[in-house]
Interface confidence: medium
């Protein structure tokens, strides 16, 4: 049943984030007469689709329609019927589908085709499903957090509307961690972006931004774990892999076919004379950290400085918002507080990883074992990536803000994507603003 309310002059938009591990649907809402103002769009709903990412449906594409049903029906309920036909729906697929496309364009197209046909059956204005590039994912994440933080607004406020605001117009950098890729995006300080592939130019609200971005495919937390396992089993030459990134007493059997299913492990692939191996956790943060560092090739850099794998990275500048899995993992580990130093985070990780698996299961009885078992790896991976991968230090750590939501909207690429596709971020500053921010924030 739909509530009969006075008609609001509002608009809605729907974006589906088809990630490597799952799909989420976001519903956004904004006052129709303020489309070009900054900070007016906000998220009213997030619906997490039950099941894996869409790339896992490659052998069962006929199930995609059912998979999307619950969340699309939820969108029907949330958005007034009168608005359905003018509500745009966008689906952006990220690194999981990029990897599938690397394996087979035909299979990736088949999945997207069925997704498009399923979404076209709803009464909304479906605008298409596509695999977005890593560069877009980084850029839209950067736009999202800075839009929500009010960084594009030319008005200087005497009050702060967001917890991270520094009351200046310096943009935040964006750090995004997914299951299959990770993005780093920021405005460097007076630094030439030495590789054209990593350079973006924006004009937003009358201001020019030269932005650095890079997406590291295969360095999302799930694919990084597969890489680490494939690398370690090479050396183990045994059906048992003692793994410092899992809790002492943890055991899990892994199929070699699953290990080599992803393009991310191709560089470590070898003929193993067993079909399965068993992970046995030994829970040692330091050894886990060392093992993870082997995934980053820092011996080669054709630029003045690099992140890893020969990818240019300018000197870090300003504050950074770290979101998606950066936030979810650190939130679980209770390490998102601004007051927790990098040294403290490392200490906490050492203690956490060393805790016996049986103890961990008892302490977190409500958490699915699949996820619970991987927090030691994920937390250690986040530290390794930020410190050794991106060259944050104990001092610059305090400039990283682990962000889940800003003003009720999730930090991530989806809002920036919709703002761009609906032309809601003007290149020039709007001439007049009918209402001051304080009336609608």
């Amino acid at each position: 049943t739909q509530n009969k309310a006075l008609p609001e002059n509002v608009k809605y938009g729907i974006v589906l984030d088809a990630g490597s591990s799952h799909t989420s649907l976001y519903i956004y809402k904004w006052p129709a007469e303020k489309e070009n103002d900054t900070g007016v769009v906000h998220q009213v709903e997030e619906c997490r689709v039950k099941g894996p990412g869409i790339s896992k449906f490659v052998q069962k594409v006929n199930e995609i329609g059912i998979y999307l049903t619950d969340c699309m029906e939820r969108a029907r309920e949330v958005i007034p019927r009168s608005q359905h036909q003018e509500t745009p729906v966008y689906l952006g697929a990220t690194a999981g589908m990029r990897l599938l496309r690397m394996e087979s364009e035909e299979l990736a197209d088949r999945v997207l085709d069925v997704v498009e046909r399923s979404l076209s059956n709803y009464p909304f204005d479906f605008q298409g499903a596509r695999i977005i590039t890593g560069q877009e994912e980084g850029a839209y994440g950067w736009i999202t957090i800075n839009y929500l933080l009010g960084k594009f607004s030319q008005k200087t406020r005497w009050f702060s509307i967001v917890p991270y605001e520094t009351n200046n117009q310096e943009t935040f950098g964006a750090l995004d961690l997914g299951g299959a890729s990770t993005q780093v995006t920021f405005v460097p300080q007076n630094q030439t972006i030495e590789s054209p592939d990593n350079a973006l130019q924006f004009r937003l609200y009358g201001k020019d931004y030269n932005v650095y971005t890079h997406s590291f495919l295969c360095y999302g937390k799930d694919q990084a774990l597969w890489q680490k396992l494939a690398k370690d089993i090479q050396v183990a030459s045994n059906e048992i892999l003692r793994d410092p990134c899992f809790h002492p007493g943890y055991k899990k059997v892994v199929n070699v076919s699953d290990l080599y299913k992803t393009p991310c492990t191709k560089r470590f692939e070898m003929t193993l004379p067993f079909q399965q191996f068993e992970i046995q956790g030994i829970g040692n943060y330091q050894q886990c950290h060392q093992s993870i560092l082997e995934l980053f090739n820092t011996s080669y850099c054709p630029y003045s400085q690099c992140a890893f794998n020969g990818i240019f990275l300018p000197p870090l500048q300003g504050d950074f918002g770290a979101f998606s899995a950066f936030y979810f993992v650190m939130k679980f580990l209770n390490l998102t507080s601004e007051k927790v130093s990098q040294e403290k985070v490392t200490e906490m990780m050492k203690k956490f990883c060393a805790q016996p698996w049986e103890e961990i299961k008892t302490s977190y009885a409500g958490v699915k074992e699949k996820y619970l078992s991987e927090y030691c790896f994920s937390g250690t991976y986040i530290l390794s990536l930020l410190l050794q991968g991106y060259h944050f230090t104990a001092d610059s750590w305090e400039h990283i803000h682990f962000i889940g939501k800003i003003q009720g909207s999730d930090a991530g690429w989806t809002l920036g994507y919709m703002l761009n596709l609906t032309n809601m971020i003007p290149a020039e500053q709007p001439l007049s603003t009918p209402l001051s921010h304080s009336t609608y924030v």
Epitope: S237, R242, S291
Partner: antibody, heavy 119, light 107 residues
């Protein structure tokens, strides 16, 4: 307490055969890969062979390939090295050692058993 | 096969002295190296694994380090029980290969 005890060494004529054993105790033998390593008189250590925990992997040094066979009996916690077509250069002290990546790579060794190949 | 070149092959040193032994790998071994001590009776004991991790029960005067393809074992202050043979071993690939060994003797 982890213990590895080699046995079966002795004097053999060139071309002859012999089987060495390594009895393991104090740990879950079936979890560990096992190595044979040897040391000729007044020489350094030389790796000989490896067998994985479930016997699905075997590796050999080129010097013994085709002549030596590594095997194990997990029910009896015992490692074996069957040696055939023996040569004088096989004369050495033979050690067994256990192996499990990440932290147990050749972390415990037996005291060794001596093989002498001489006519 | 990966060659492990160990130096020096022998070393005379005094009690309390600091000594370093080195192994150079002919190919990248990514830190997969152990150091072993062999006492005159033939007993073999692992001291260090993963290039720099000290085994439990091994005195803190022993330490392992890496610089590129060079791996070092350092004894900060020699004690009488340290006079023995020392070997490095790479475990990144088969065949496993040992360094030629270093005989550490009392001066």
């Amino acid at each position: 307490e982890v213990q590895l005890v080699e046995s079966g060494g002795g004097l053999v004529k060139p071309g002859g055969s012999l089987k060495l054993s390594c009895a393991a105790s104090g740990f879950t033998f079936s979890d560990y890969g096992m190595h044979w390593v040897r040391q000729a008189p007044e020489k350094g250590l030389e790796w000989v062979a490896y067998i994985s925990s479930g016997s699905s992997i075997m590796y050999y040094a080129d010097t013994v390939k085709g002549r030596f066979t590594i095997s194990r009996d997990n029910a009896k916690n015992t490692l074996f090295l069957q040696m055939a077509s023996l040569r004088s250069e096989d004369t050495a002290m033979y050690y067994c050692a256990r192996d499990l990546y990440y932290d147990h790579v050749l972390d415990y060794w037996g005291q060794g058993t001596t093989l002498t190949v001489s006519s | 096969d990966i060659q492990m070149t160990q130096s020096p092959s022998s070393l005379s040193a005094s009690l309390g002295e600091r000594v370093s032994l080195t192994c150079r790998a002919s190919q990248e071994i990514r830190g997969y190296l152990i150091w072993l001590q062999q006492k005159p009776g033939g007993t073999i004991k692992r001291l260090i694994y993963a290039a720099s991790t000290l085994d439990s029960g091994v005195p803190k005067r022993f330490s392992g380090s890496r610089s590129g393809s060079d791996y070092s074992l350092t004894i900060s202050s020699l004690e009488s029980e340290d006079f023995a043979d020392y070997y490095c071993l790479q475990y990144t690939s088969y065949p496993r290969t040992f360094g030629g060994g270093t005989k550490l003797e009392i001066k």
